[in-house]
């Protein structure tokens, strides 16, 4: 057993990044940190369980940004983040540090959280060693921190697996059963090979120099590039220098509670189902009783709050704890060039002229689905539509009854009569034609226009 300790030194804009604080126009805020430890060096999905443990910091001091001021390093919570581990310290692990902002304004639902930055480091670290310092960048942010793993007595060693008792201490307290076998005394840490890098090397046996991840050489002074052989196991091949398969550490599946085993260099790793963690998924983890769902998410567990959980997230949030804000506008839900507005509680589309509907899906200038009344027909053109109305009807949708005689279509004093199929002109004496447009000569011949070329007078005449 032991404790992993993390000390955050600073969090603020990195070189050339974040000229303005993210707090501007958001009102008072404060930071807190979440640390997540996973065994092994595999690249894991952010959602997989923190199998070695996790911890949440206290909230930092309340901070209100002056909108035009450049963002300084942001005020941090006091104290260490401590993640206790029950079993052996694995030596190789993934460290995930999340920086969260808590907004304390008057927004609906009380404080809102947003993830400012997440850094992931895969590291080799011996328990009992010195503090290791690191600087990590996430987007425009820079995080400076130190970390170490230390054993808690009676556990000792670089993996906290050996038990000891202090010199001259009795083996058991009064009235207790005999203790587990203990070494005779707590030995001093082994003396490493002379010259072994204090920063990049460590030893479990006197005279050796073992290197942390990313370093090589007899004294761990030489940085290494990633080898393509890293994921293999077994004895070294003389031809390639790579490892060749040997017996598998996952044989017999050491993972409890439905965990699945995957092999890591020289070891194994359990991917635990939600609600369990530990090297072999033997430890029950976060439950609904811990209130794990952010942003108003509802916690769903088994028959009681102490079983494994999931979070039902409100709209606009996702992640196993509803901690990630969804940019719902990135899905481009507004059609026809509409402007998307994510109001938090709802999505709105501001439509361009000529479009309507919740997602701007209705084209107001489109004949599709557009009805012209009273037998009118829809005619598209010029990005708009109009109705060509049947005789006797008018208006935008042909809904208005038109008076065909209103325009006085009958010439020369002819009288207009509205008829179901149009209009009829009763011509005054001396006139004829559909609109009484032609005078009648006394000899009975109308003054018709001249005959078109090729027609002789007296031939039947057709006029449009």
């Amino acid at each position: 057993a032991g404790v992993f300790e993390l000390q955050i030194h600073s969090f603020g804009p990195g070189p050339g990044g974040a000229p303005r604080s993210p707090y501007s126009a958001r009102g008072p805020c404060r930071l807190f940190f979440r640390v997540c430890l996973k065994p092994g060096l595999s690249e894991e999905a952010a959602e997989s369980p923190c199998a070695l443990g996790a911890a949440l910091s206290a909230r930092g001091p309340v901070y209100t940004e002056q909108p035009e001021a450049p963002a300084p390093d942001l005020p941090l919570p006091n104290g260490l983040l401590q993640v206790p581990f029950r079993d052996a310290w694995p030596g190789t692990f993934s460290l995930i540090i999340e920086t969260w902002r808590e907004e304390l304004g008057d927004q609906i639902g009380g404080p809102a959280w947003s993830l400012l930055a997440r850094v992931t480091r895969r590291r080799r670290l011996a328990a009992g060693g010195p503090w290791a310092g690191d600087i990590q960048r996430a987007g425009a942010w820079e995080l400076r921190f130190s970390y170490r793993a230390r054993c808690e007595l009676p556990a000792v060693g670089t993996a906290c697996t050996r038990l000891c008792r202090p010199r001259s201490a009795s083996r058991c307290g009064p009235g207790l059963r005999p203790c587990a076998p203990l070494e005779d005394e707590c030995e001093a840490p082994p003396v490493c090979r002379a010259g072994c890098s204090l920063e990049h090397g460590f030893c479990e046996q006197p005279g050796e120099c073992r290197c942390l991840e990313g370093w090589t050489g007899p004294l761990c002074m030489v940085p290494v590039s990633t080898s393509s052989c890293l994921g293999l196991r077994g004895p070294s091949s003389t031809t390639t220098g790579c490892l060749v398969p040997g017996p598998g550490p996952c044989d017999g599946n050491p993972c409890a509670n439905g965990g699945s085993c995957s092999e890591t260099p020289g070891s194994f790793e359990c991917t635990c189902p939600r609600g369990f963690y530990g090297l072999r998924c033997e430890v029950s983890g976060v439950t609904c009783a811990d209130g794990p769902c952010f942003n108003g998410g509802l916690c769903v567990g088994g028959a009681d709050p102490d079983s494994a959980y999931i979070c039902h997230c409100p709209p606009g949030f996702q992640g196993s704890n509803c901690e990630k804000r969804v940019d719902r506008c990135s899905l481009q839900p507004c059609r026809n060039g509409g402007l998307c507005l994510d109001l938090g509680h709802a999505l709105r589309c501001r439509c361009r002229a000529g479009f309507a509907g919740p997602r701007c899906e209705h084209d107001l200038n489109d004949c599709a689905g557009r009805a012209c009344a009273n037998g009118g027909t829809c005619v598209e053109g010029g990005g708009a539509h109009r109705c060509s109305c049947a005789l006797g009807f008018g208006g935008r949708d042909c809904r208005e009854r038109a008076d065909p005689c209103a325009a006085r279509p009958c010439a020369h004093g002819g009288r207009c009569y509205a008829h179901f199929s149009g209009l009829v002109c009763a011509c005054a004496p001396g006139y004829m034609g559909a609109r009484c447009e032609f005078p009648v000569h006394p000899d009975g011949v109308s003054a018709l226009p001249a005959a078109p070329p090729g027609l002789r007078p007296g031939d039947p005449q057709r006029y449009p």
């Epitope: 949440l56 609906i108 639902g109 009380g110 404080p111 609904c288 009783a289 209130g291 794990p292 952010f294 942003n295 108003g296 998410g297 509802l298 916690c299 769903v300 567990g301 709050p305 039902h312 409100p314 709209p315 509680h345 709802a346």
Partner: antibody, heavy 119, light 111 residues
């Protein structure tokens, strides 16, 4: 304004299934909220039965888990309760209610529909 | 399950009097992440469905008269009506939403 209206048979025989419909007007059930069924027994005791969220996730009272199903028809903006193997103890007034994620409060209740389980 | 109990089961008061009723949960309803108590109070008048009065133990729902006040944290909560009116005749329920949803047994207020 959001309106919820319960409907379904007022009398169900023992061992049969109770099926109720909640018709929602004024708001799309796929936009937000969790849509609950809550019942009130003759002695006035209130019991939350389960919900279906705006995205179709469901959660039920563990004591009813083997008998209850909440589903929805988004095209009709309705959600449904089905309770199997009913007994006289399921006689109650059944309310459909929407709940607000931010406040975890049961914001708006339908008028309720009375269901009697009797042969 | 989280069990909610209320006391008294009923009380009779005169208009203008101050009333307090109590609600107790079998486990803490305080969420350390959100710094909130997930407890609500509901009012059910005769022949009507319940209506939310208070959420987060002490936040008054909009439109609720300020004579209604919620207080308490953890496992012990109180609803106070500073000056009872005739229209406050109802049954009052507390409800936890820390994990699932459980209602209290109710307090019947008679004027």
């Amino acid at each position: 304004d959001v309106q919820l209206q319960e409907s379904g048979p007022g009398l169900v025989k023992p061992s049969q299934s109770l099926s109720l419909t909640c018709s929602v007007t004024g708001y799309s059930i796929t936009s937000d909220f969790y849509w609950n069924w809550i019942r009130q027994f003759p002695g006035n005791k209130l019991e939350w039965m389960g919900y279906i969220t705006y995205d179709g996730s469901t959660n039920y009272d563990p004591s009813l888990k083997n008998r209850i199903s909440i589903t929805r028809d988004t095209s009709k903006n309705q959600f449904f309760l089905k309770l199997n193997s009913v007994t006289a103890e399921d006689t109650a007034t059944y309310y459909c209610v929407y709940g607000d994620f931010n406040r975890h409060a049961m914001d708006y209740w339908g008028q309720g529909t009375s269901v009697t389980v009797s042969s | 399950d989280i069990v909610m109990s209320q006391s008294p089961s009923s009380l009779a008061v005169s208009a203008g009097e101050k009333v307090t009723m109590s609600c107790r949960s079998s486990q803490s309803l305080f969420n350390s992440r959100t710094r909130k108590n997930y407890l609500a109070w509901y009012q059910q008048k005769p022949g009507q469905p319940p209506k939310v009065l208070i959420y987060w133990a002490s936040t008054r729902e909009s439109g609720v008269p300020d004579r209604f006040t919620g207080s308490g944290s953890g496992t012990d909560f109180t609803l106070t009506i500073s000056s009872v009116q005739a229209e406050d005749l109802a049954v009052y329920y507390c409800e936890q939403s820390f994990y699932l949803f459980t209602f209290g047994t109710g307090t019947k207020l008679e004027i």
